[in-house]
Structures are given as C-alpha cells and as structure tokens.
Amino acid sequence: DAHKSEVAHRFKDLGEEHFKDLVLVAFSQYLQQCPFEEHLKLVNEVTEFAKTCVADETAENCDKSLHTLFGDKLCTVATLRETYGDMADCCAKQEPERNECFLQHKDDKPDLPPLVRPEVDVMCTAFQEHEDTFLKKYLYEVARRHPYFYAPELLFFAQKYKAAFTECCQAADKGACLLPKLDELRDQGKASSAKQRLKCASLQKFGERAFKAWSVARVSQRFPKADFTEVTKVVTDLTKVHTECCHGDLLECADDRAELAKYMCENQDSLSSKLKECCEKPLLEKSHCLAHVENDEMPADLHALTDDYVESKDVCKNYAEAKDVFMGMFLYEYSRRHPDYSAMLLLRLAKAYEATLEKCCATADPHGCYAKVFDEFQPLVEDPQNLVKHNCELFEQFGEYKFQNELLVRYTKKVPQVSTPTLVEVSRNLGKVGTKCCKQPEAKRMPCVEDYLSVVLNQLCVLHEKTPVSDRVTKCCTESLVNRRPCFSALEVDETYLPKAFNAETFTFHADMCTLSEKEQQVKKQTALAELVKHKPKATNEQLKTVMEDFAAFVEKCCKADDKEACFAEEGPKLVAASETALA
C-alpha cells in the first residue's frame, strides 16, 4: 500500500523510540568511524524531520525515499573524505547507486580500538545518570563493529543489556551479578552477528534463490506440520525481511519483521504447536523467541517420499512445468522428515536430486535413469556424519583449547597465506563447535555442527574477501555456498607454499604475558603456533605438540620467576633454538 511519506509511515509504525534506535544503528553501520555525538546529532535531525512529515505528509521532502533522506544526511558529514577516503565518492551518485556504494564500503573488520569494559561502578553510575545515552552508546558501539548485525535483533540485545544494568546496579555485589550477564550478552551478540553475516553473504553473493532454499529447509524442519503453502509464505516474508536488513533498509526490515511475527502468532494452528509461549511476549522478545523456537514434532503419518519423487511417472513433467516450485516442494518434504540433518546437507541433497533430473529427464527412459536417485544420497549424508563423529571424538579427547590448536594447525597447513590473526580467530571459533554441539543428543548433532561451521567459515570468507591472499580460499568461498564446508574439509596441505622466513620478533615474549587473561594468553600461544606452522609447514603434529608443551612450561616458569622480564629474555631464545632443532 502506497504512502505519501515513507518516513512518516515508518515513524508511525515503529514508534519514536524504535525509529531513533534503528536510524542510529543504520548510520553507525554505514559510517563506522564517526564519533557517537555526530551520529546522535544526525539521528535527532532525521527524527525531527520525520515528525514534521507525520504532522503533514505533504510537507517538503516528505515524499522522498528513505535512502534519499538518509543518504543526503550521511553526505552532510564534513569529514567524510578525510575519514573514509573514496567512500566520499558515493555522495556524487544518485539513488539507488549511492546506497549500493555505501553498502560496498561496509567494513567487516573496521580499524577500531577494542572495547574496554570500565569498572562496574563507573558503568552503573553512567547507566543511572544518563540511561538513554548509555544504551544508545551500546547500539552505536556494536553496530559500527558489526555492520551487518540484524538491526531489530540488536534492539532486543539492547533491551537485555538494559535489564542487566537495571537489576545488577541495585545488587549487593554488582560485579558478581553484572559481569557474567555482560559476558553472556557479548558471546550471544558475536554469535548473532556471525549468523546474520552468513544470511547477508548468502543473499548478496549467491542471490535470493539460495537464501530462499536455505530458509525452506530451516522453516520446514521447524514447522514440519505446516503445509507447503504456509512454509512458502513464511519463507517469502522472511526473505523480504533479511533482504531489507542486509540492504541497509532497517526501518522497513524491523517493520516487516514485526508483521511476520504477528502473522505467525495469528496462524499458530497451521504452523507449529511450539509458538504459544513466544506469542505471549512483547514484540522484541516475541520476534527473538520465534526465530529460535525449537522444532515441532513431526506428523505421524508422513507418506513415503519415493512415491512422488522417484516412483511417480510424472516426475519429469512436474519438474519441467515449474522447476522452482517442484524443487521447493522436494526440499520442504525432505527437510520436514529430517530435523537430524543440517540445512546445508538438505540443500546438497536437493542439488543432487535436481542434477539427476536434469540429466535423466532428457533420456529415453527417465524413470529407469532416476530410479536409484535416493541411493546416491548416501555418500552425501555420510560425509557430515563422519565429520561430526571424527571432530567430536577429537574434542572429547583434547578439550576445547587443544582442539582449537589441532584445527589451527590443520587450517594453517591448508591455507598458510591467510593472515595469522584471521587463522587464529577462525580456528578458535571452529573449535568452539565442540563445546556448543558435541554434548547435544545424536539427532541434534549434525545440524548443530555443520550449520555452525558454515557460519564460521563465512567469517573466513568475508575477512579473506577484504584482502584476498589465497586462491584456494577464494575458490571454496565463491564456487558454492552449500559446498563451502566440504570444500574446506577436502583441502590438503598446500604443497606450493614456501615456508615463511624465521623472524625472532614473532617468537619473543615479555613479562606482560603474565598479566593477560587466560583467553589472551591462549591467543598469544595460538598466534605463535600458527607462525610456527608457517615457518615449518612440514612439522608433524607430534613435533608441534612437543614444542607447544615446552612453550607452555616456559611461560609458566617465567611467570613464577622473581624477575619475570629477565627470565623471558634469557629463556626465550633458548626455547626458540630448541624448537628449531626439534622441528629440523
């Protein structure tokens, strides 16, 4: 339905508070280097303008698109060229090219200082004295560091952030109450950001069809009692929501997400028996809850899939008449029967089935040709099953830290050209799969493991895209979304790699190592491990294990010494020499 003023429409739909928060997130995700105060100023100007349009939709400029209004506002920033370089050239373009230009300049790894958490009392004072500013600062800091964060979900996180401070700043032991909550929010936020980054990459790099296919698989697993028409409706609406958010259309995205939540709650009976609790919650919690709802129970009387998709004489006719609908139905039917499969596996099976039909439907005896198509699925299913079994065994054997090290060695040997910080970050995240998934019951393991790995490998892909250094990474990242994980798994040691020259500075450590948190110490050690592998790519796991044990002993010894710095200076070069010998 057409509105005279889009900005007035969204302001009225969302309400002033959410409108302002979403505009702040949008601006922070576009201009990631701008100071907080500058963004607040821009947001207030936009909000005042929106109010004039609510009062009179025919007022000057109120008929302009949101992209035009927001783009014009961003282009008023005085220091645009100094701060952002060629992003300033976007302002010379017309919409929609200008918005596309801004999107292309979003930086997944902006050069921003790490967020330092102030003392609890300092945070509580700031929260109590300037609650609104404090919460808006949270939105700003998260949004600028995560330019693809799912905006309506970020508002939910801000609400949880507020609740944590409201509760804990009144507690007897503020720190004991607040810090675990903030840690949990930080971890959940990073996970949410990474998941959304995969959705945006899927849409932007592989198109709407790829995203819709993934959504059909997931929605069908969640709502196995819903019929195909209902699943299609939810998937279409969900695709619109994510397309908008990934495209920077955050007001439309949040508005449409609320509409979808409303629809789902009004149609619970035909979707899932698991929505009741979610639908009793207020908007932000409701949408979050619906997005994370558990799978409904499978209907008892599901027919054999082979009837319609293998044994039917009409397979080729149905496929030819409406390929996308037919494949959508296949994916829906297969997915609702297999909550135990990862979404990526389900998409691979659909791809294999489609390839078989393409081949067989052109033959004289199509049925004879595709009669055994489901048997061909077996190796595709066994591959992630083996992956889960093997990696969970390793995780249980080693524990998270040593499992991360195992993966770090594996991936450094596969793609040694990738920067060490990226290899460490990605391997640490890959290693967390064990903690997250290996304790799950058998039926939940594969979807947990493989779909989580897809999220983490997408982080590698987006970081690598910024500064491409490895053709192998580029190939795995760009050829096929659904085959990314198998592509990386299949990579062997890169035999073409020339070992990195030894740099003593890389392996020189100081007393400051002792004051680092456990996590920071691990990162330091893992950085050294990756550099060691780059220097000696032919080193065996046993050799590397010995060196790492010696290194851990060296750190422990020197951190116990009276003169720590002297110990590091004296023992460090000895360790390096011994390691060189051990790895010769």
Epitope: A304, D308, Y309, S312, K313, N318
Partner: antibody, heavy 121, light 111 residues
C-alpha cells in the same frame, strides 16, 4: 472397516459450485493417491483427476480449470471443488484409492458408493 | 485426448461360456502394461479385477485373466458364472497422470 464415503452431492443450479468430500475410515489417506471418477446416468466411467500423497494434482483435460482436488490428511478427507457447473456435469461422483502413491495407475482398488450431483434449473 | 476403445460394446453369453473382451488404446499405455479391468453392477461402484494388464486383484476368482501389451489388451473369463453378468470397463494409465482414461464399457448379459 476400510471404506470411503462421499458426501456433498445434491441439486445445484447451472453456473453454481459444489464441494464434494470423501472421508476415509479404517486406513490413512496419506499412503495412496486418491482419484475422482464420475458416471453420468446410464453412461460409462469418466476420469476426473487424482491427488498424489504429496499433494500433486493431475486433471483430465476437460476438468482442468473448473475442478480442483485437495486433501486434508489430518481429517483423512479428500475434496472435489466443482465450479461453473453445467447440465452435462450431472452424474454420480465416486472417489477411489489408487494402487500407487505418487501418480495415477488407473488401478483404483477401493471405491466409495458415490454421491449424486444434479445440475438443473 | 487419448482414446480407449472397448469391443464389443455389448455381449450376450451363457453360464459356462468362455468370454473375451478387448480394449485398444490410441497410444501405448505407460510401461506397456499400465492397464486395468473393472466390473460394475447396477447401483454399485466399480470393482477392480485386473491391474498391470495381467495381475489379479485381491479376492478376484482365477477364472478372470488379462493379457496384452502396448495398445492391445484382452480380458478373458474362462467359464462364465451367474454373478459375472455385469458391465466391464478397461482403464489405461499413460505417461502423464492427467491422461488416465476409461474405455466405453462392455455390457455382458445372459443369452
């Protein structure tokens, strides 16, 4: 007892619509394709169409557009929606269970007793 | 549209006779054998006798048999019994489920 029972027939004016139901008992409809066949008074059998277990529908060329078959597995019922009815649609309408699940083999091994539809002004 | 032609359209015979009814399709049936035979008595729904050209449906006496392939098929009743007087229909399945078709019927009466 395994049986199919049609209902919804009756007198309808030309141009009118009617929805016939076919309720199954003693077995689950989700395991077989279900077809509709009609028989004008004193005439032979005429195939209307079929719905597969997965919901794929297939219609005789003359029925396409006017007739729609659907199923509700939770109610164990198949439906035939008939629109723009004409005098020549007067017949007994049977629902029948095909031997196959995904298509029409022409071998219907379980039939309902039929419901009479009369189109007349 | 695909035509199914049954002959004869009517037939009189006596108890104990051997009776043959033929069915011809304008196109080959699916897999060359997707043809069924039905028996219908007044006021009753049809009853499946034969499927896949020659397979006897459950509970059907062995005096009924079917044969044929492609476009030409035959239903044989080896020794007619009093309860066999009825109308018989053939039905063919073709490469598309939309094309399933019945023959015009053969009315078998007492001579």
């Amino acid at each position: 007892e395994v049986q199919l029972v049609e209902s919804g027939g009756g007198l309808v004016q030309p141009g009118g619509s009617l929805r016939l139901s076919c309720a199954a008992s003693g077995f689950s409809l989700s395991s077989n394709a279900m077809g509709w066949v009609r028989q004008a008074p004193g005439k032979g059998l005429e195939y209307i169409g079929i719905i597969s277990v997965g919901g794929f529908t297939y219609y005789a060329s003359w029925a396409k557009g006017r007739f729609t078959i659907s199923r509700d597995n939770s109610k164990n019922t198949v439906y035939l929606q008939m629109n723009s009815l004409r005098a020549e649609d007067t017949a007994t309408y049977f629902c029948a269970r095909d031997r196959h699940g995904g298509d029409s083999s022409g071998a219907f091994y379980l039939w309902g007793q039929g419901t009479l539809v009369t189109v007349s002004s | 549209d695909i035509q199914m032609t049954q002959s004869p359209s009517s037939l009189s015979a006596s108890v104990g006779d051997r009776v043959t009814i033929t069915c011809q399709s304008s196109e080959s049936v699916y897999s060359n054998n997707q043809l069924s035979w039905y028996q219908q008595k007044p006021g009753q729904p049809p009853k499946l006798l034969i499927y896949d050209a020659s397979d006897l449906a459950s509970g059907v006496p062995s005096r009924f048999s079917g044969s044929g392939s492609g476009t030409d098929f035959t239903l044989t009743i080896s020794s007619l019994q009093p309860e066999d007087f009825a109308t018989y229909y053939c039905a063919g399945g073709f490469s598309s489920s939309s094309d399933t078709a019945f023959g015009g019927g053969t009315k078998l009466t007492v001579l």
